[in-house]
């Protein structure tokens, strides 16, 4: 029961986390800056992984996508890649974990197969969460670097004078969404890995066969063992003493004087 709960909770937590990673990737508020506040209107600029937007206090918002001619930094491309890899891995992990859920029966799927699928999805969630956390952290580092490098200056360009205003970008809501979502996916993955241990079969009984000796003496064959997976608490090898040429699972209807029961 505890295993099913752990697996189910891990799945739900990961699902929320991956939904958050997708939301963060699509959000425009990765970085924000208040441009100025004049008597006419307050203007805000916020930038995401895919486009930049300007919003006025009147509610008017205009967004423009990034184009290659703007020469996007390699770091931004790296963040995009990390987030997409995180989403893809997370989505595959979710798909695998649905079939791995103990509460869902698909044909005659073995518990060992479910355990393996749970472990696979768990690892995928962990990597997905790490990708998201890494992506958001790289972007945050870009903002911090940009914050300290921003300066106001003036120069003459083509067509007239050009002035740069000292405006600084700060952390947007998407960064916090990304960090939390990445953390949840990571936690969900760990829970799935823990659930995998409990899902693995406790004991697998192998039919051990021992034979009679030619005389009236009892033959002891040390071959009869119960093999354990190592996941369960019972890891002791149990010797089976059997004088007859019978398998361990057979019922002894008429015990002979040579049998040790």
């Amino acid at each position: 029961m505890a295993v099913t709960a752990c697996q189910g909770l891990g799945f739900v937590v990961s699902l929320i986390g991956i939904a958050g990673i997708i939301a963060a990737t699509c959000m425009d508020q990765w970085s924000t800056q208040d441009l100025y506040n004049n008597p006419v209107t307050a203007v805000f600029n916020y930038q995401g992984l895919w486009r930049s937007c300007v919003r006025e206090s009147s509610g008017f918002t205009e967004c423009r996508g990034y184009f290659t001619l703007l020469g996007l930094p390699a770091m931004l491309q790296a963040v995009r890649a990390l987030m997409i890899v995180g989403i893809v891995l997370g989505a595959i992990g979710l798909l695998v974990s649905i079939f791995a859920l103990k509460c869902i029966r698909i044909g005659s799927m073995e518990d060992s197969a479910k355990a393996n699928m749970t472990l696979t999805s768990g690892i995928m969630f962990i990597v997905s969460g790490l990708c998201a956390i890494a992506g958001v952290s790289v972007f945050a580092n870009m903002l911090v670097t940009n914050f300290w490098m921003s300066t106001a200056n003036m120069y003459t360009g083509m067509g007239g004078m050009v002035q740069t205003v000292q405006t600084r970008y700060t952390f947007g809501a998407a960064l916090f969404v990304g960090w939390v979502a990445g953390g949840l996916t990571l936690i969900g993955g760990v829970m799935m890995c823990i659930a995998c241990r409990g899902l693995a079969p406790e004991e697998t009984n192998y039919k051990a066969v021992s034979y009679h000796a030619s005389g009236h003496s009892v033959a002891y064959k040390p071959g009869g063992f119960k093999a354990s997976t190592g996941f369960g608490s019972n890891t002791k090898n149990k010797k089976i003493y059997d004088g007859g040429a019978r398998t361990e699972d057979e019922v002894q209807s008429y015990p002979s004087k040579h049998d040790y029961v």
């Epitope: 209107t41 930038q47 300007v54 006025e56 009147s58 703007l70 921003s150």
Partner: nanobody, 121 residues
Framework: AVQLVDSGGGLVQAGGSLRLSCAVS????????MGWYRQAPGKQRELVAT???????NYADSVKGRFTIARDNAKNTVYLHMDALKPEDTAVYYC???????????????WGQGTQVTVSA
Amino acid sequence: AVQLVDSGGGLVQAGGSLRLSCAVSGSFLNIVTMGWYRQAPGKQRELVATTTRGGSTNYADSVKGRFTIARDNAKNTVYLHMDALKPEDTAVYYCNAEIIPGFLQQLTLYWGQGTQVTVSA
């Protein structure tokens, strides 16, 4: 590179009208505001009118009711309709645009070369 091309200036009689236009060209992310400033000989450059992309406008007290600023967001162009012109309106009119040039780049103020408006008495 971003370029502002202003045009429409000239010589006009007092009480007459003119229309100035300014187009932004080049690669950039967002235009925040566009507007017009003027500089009369021996004077400081002063605000005439500005507009945001959303249509919020701001006028200098001296031109209120006479000048109208309009924009065409699709063409990234701003217009200044000047009516009831006075001799004191004589100046070089400069187009101005506040632009975010690229990703995580600072707000940049671009200026046009200026167009001369002369109002004769």
